[in-house]
Interface confidence: medium
Amino acid sequence: EVEKTACPSGKKAREIDESLIFYKKWELEACVDAALLATQMDRVNAIPFTYEQLDVLKHKLDELYPQGYPESVIQHLGYLFLKMSPEDIRKWNVTSLETLKALLEVNKGHEMSPQVATLIDRFVKGRGQLDKDTLDTLTAFYPGYLCSLSPEELSSVPPSSIWAVRPQDLDTCDPRQLDVLYPKARLAFQNMNGSEYFVKIQSFLGGAPTEDLKALSQQNVSMDLATFMKLRTDAVLPLTVAEVQKLLGPHVEGLKAEERHRPVRDWILRQRQDDLDTLGLGLQGGIPNGYLVLDLSMQEALS
């Protein structure tokens, strides 16, 4: 906290300019009018203040706007944004995408900070849903943004926004998140033809149910092993050997290298060894010939 002292004669700031970098903290406090600062915030960003000086400028704005800064000031905060706490940001009402972009630019190249997370949360809540333009902006700055949301938060993403999602945006999503996103993607891309559809839906398939995988196996999609390994185990288990062969196409040979890993390992255990042998890959661990397969989950459902 800077002590209140009178501004020395002749030092009263008439505008925000480079001469202020030579003011001591108490001089900034005493000689810079908060209203002037608010109207010339865009100039602050072009002046190499020290962090201590930025603290004083923030303090002045806090005094002027105890209920939270207006958007006209927020949009021009620039580097001063990094001085804000999540508590400060919770007082703001940010509605303009331009304001959001300006502040994300300040933090560009860094991990998502608590300040940025709070800002995004305030912005999205203010909009009511994660629209395409917002999602475009957020994933451009933070490719992992989508996967940082809870399944509940993801449910507010309209299918139209899915067009903005790139494969790398889903890299860190877990199955629960993909369960929410997959039906939206299916809806968004439903009017595309087979090969184009597969290219778009591929990164969302970690949320696909068995029946959709069966349908894809009829379309010569040649799914790569990396995608197959990300599928839900419970969705893969009911697939037949013939269906998996069709689904993977020439990539089926990759099953051998993955036979000890899920979901391939669990899928092998559910197949007849005879059927596995037809692949000619030397996959072992299937159900021996002559054994009866009891589907206990089906039995429980019937009883």
Epitope: N45, A46, P48, T50, Y51
Partner: nanobody
Framework: LQLVESGGGLVQPGGSLRLTCAAS????????IGWFRQAPGKEREGVSS????????NYADSVKGRFTISKGNARNTLYLQMNSLKPEDTAVYFC???????????????WGQGTSVTVS
């Protein structure tokens, strides 16, 4: 990225010193840079700054006409020529650099350890 100051020392009032700030790990072409000082028991204050292009310089009122800031031809050095030194110039002098000017947001991010100047 490192900044190292040198050239400080003991000098009589009215004398001169030339401080050097050497940057290692980066060149100063795209950096706004400046000299700051801190006297014992006092707050750190700005002395002089120079824009990344070298075309724009600024000075604190207390040193105007006596100190000159400049960038070296080697692209990684900054100088502060101090003439007509006074006892009140006694302080530890720091150089600082800011890469943010292209940002367009920036503040002084990188600081040297300082070099001591005593005028007595």
């Amino acid at each position: 990225l490192q900044l190292v100051e040198s050239g400080g020392g003991l000098v009589q009032p009215g004398g001169s010193l030339r401080l050097t700030c050497a940057a290692s790990g980066f060149t100063l072409d795209n950096y706004a840079i400046g000299w700051f000082r801190q006297a014992p028991g006092k707050e750190r204050e700005g002395v002089s700054s120079i824009s990344s292009s070298g075309g724009s310089t600024n000075y604190a009122d207390s040193v105007k006409g006596r100190f000159t800031i400049s960038k070296g031809n080697a692209r990684n050095t900054l100088y502060l020529q101090m003439n007509s030194l006074k006892p009140e110039d006694t302080a530890v002098y720091f150089c600082a650099a800011s890469p943010r000017q292209l940002g367009p947001y920036y503040a002084m991010d990188y600081w040297g350890q300082g070099t001591s100047v005593t005028v007595s």
